[in-house]
């Protein structure tokens, strides 16, 4: 139990972390679902994509997301780890040229069309809070995670280490 300062300590260097290398260390095509097994789906509506959190019908196909994994180096003076303070950052792309973005002003998660190099808003620090679940923390806003709110994805502030395990910020990745 670290309290609020614990989360800040974990994430204090995110703003300053630099992504080492332009190309990802690996890419992984997976379906994304919530801790409660609802699917994250993407629908094209009026020339823009909407993101939904919903129960799929029995044989309905799950949408896939391309996760690109990047290594990110903490500055040694921040991390205390010298060259050893590495994080994994991911970008999430459900369709060509579109990436999930953190809109910190609106506390929302949006799909934006953009070219590389991607803006910082498209990068999320990968956390495992559970052996088969991941969480996505905004690079641009330490302590803020992608979460589920009212059947949509939203940005959720996590203000203590205990809340890192709350179900609404936990997601499952599956190849099927």
């Amino acid at each position: 139990a670290f309290g609020i300062s614990g989360v800040q300590k974990y994430t204090r260097a995110l703003h300053d972390s630099s992504i080492t290398g332009i190309s990802p260390i690996t890419e992984y095509l997976a379906s994304l679902s919530t801790y409660n097994d609802q699917s994250i789906t993407f629908a094209l509506e009026d020339e823009s994509y909407e993101i939904y959190v919903e129960d799929l019908k029995k044989d309905e196909k799950k949408d896939k997301v391309l996760l690109s994994y990047y290594e990110s180096q903490h500055p040694s003076n921040e991390s205390g780890d010298g060259v050893d303070g590495k994080m994994l950052m991911v970008t999430l792309s459900p369709t060509k040229d579109f990436w999930l973005h953190a809109n910190n002003k609106e506390h929302s998660v949006e799909l934006h069309k953009c070219e590389k190099p991607l803006p910082d808003q498209a990068f999320f620090v990968l956390h495992n809070m559970h052996s088969n679940c991941v969480s996505f923390e905004c690079k641009t806003d330490p302590g803020v995670f992608i979460g589920v709110k009212d059947n949509h994805l939203a940005l959720i502030k996590v203000d203590s280490s205990e809340n890192l395990c709350t179900e609404n910020i936990l997601f499952k990745l599956s190849e099927t």
């Epitope: 050893d84 994994l88 990968l126 956390h127 088969n132 890192l164 395990c165």
Partner: antibody
């Protein structure tokens, strides 16, 4: 320099208990998942237990579940393995290992301690 | 559980040889696969992670490849210090599992 130093191994009778410790230094301990791996004499490597960076989640294989408990004290940069109901097949060198990246389990174990030998015998 | 089957279990080779070790998984997974080198009486050393990424400080004669169920560790030109036992390990699904090991001996 990253250092992991195990201690607490020794000879114990079947059914007995032992507590292993791992003192970590040279890195921000509370940012990393930690894992115990063991190696029986002349055999391969076997995963024993893992703990999340906050200490909120613990994971075990069936072979030790219910008998072993992994824990950590982030204030002391220390990892522990409480081993109860020990069996002859638990005889092994036990290694403390650290994950590759902050906050998650991806990327193998770049850092290992020197190991501590646990011998279970009557 | 994902079983990791390493082959061969042992091999004899000479300095300068190209050596290939394979790891076959019982089911497919993302490429969270690592390779370790272990010498007698020593702790394992991480060589490759993410199936193909070279760990800092590891000589470039070591390389990894593969995805899904088939993974390979290659030593392009075996050096005297490379005679050791090599293990693969999957980190994609719990329980974490290791291959049985491949002992590389001097011919």
């Amino acid at each position: 320099e990253v250092q992991l130093v195990e201690s607490g191994g020794g000879l114990v009778q079947p059914g007995g208990s032992l507590r292993l410790s791992c003192a970590a230094s040279g890195f921000t301990f509370n940012n990393y998942w930690m894992t115990w791996v063991r190696q029986a004499p002349g055999k391969g490597l076997e995963w024993v237990a893992s703990i999340t960076y906050t200490g909120g989640g613990t994971y075990y294989p069936d072979s030790v579940k219910g008998r072993f408990t992994i824990s950590r004290d982030n204030a002391k940069s220390s990892l522990y393995l409480q081993m109860n109901s020990l069996r002859a097949e638990d005889t092994a060198v036990y290694y403390c290992t650290r994950a590759n990246y902050y906050y998650n389990t991806y990327g193998g174990f770049p850092y290992w301690g020197q190991g501590t030998l646990v011998t279970v015998s009557s | 559980d994902i079983q990791m089957t390493q082959s061969p279990s042992s091999l004899s080779a000479s300095v300068g040889d190209r050596v290939t070790i394979t790891c076959l998984a019982s089911e497919g997974f993302s490429n969270d696969l690592a390779w370790y080198q272990q010498k007698p009486g020593k702790s394992p050393k991480l060589l490759i992670y993410a199936a193909s990424r070279l760990q800092d400080g590891v000589p470039s004669r070591f390389s990894g490849s593969g995805s899904g169920t088939d993974f390979t560790l290659t030593i392009s030109s075996l050096q005297p210090e490379d005679f050791a036992t090599y293990f693969c390990q999957q980190g994609s699904k719990y329980p974490l599992t290791f291959g049985g090991g491949t002992k590389v001996e001097i011919k």
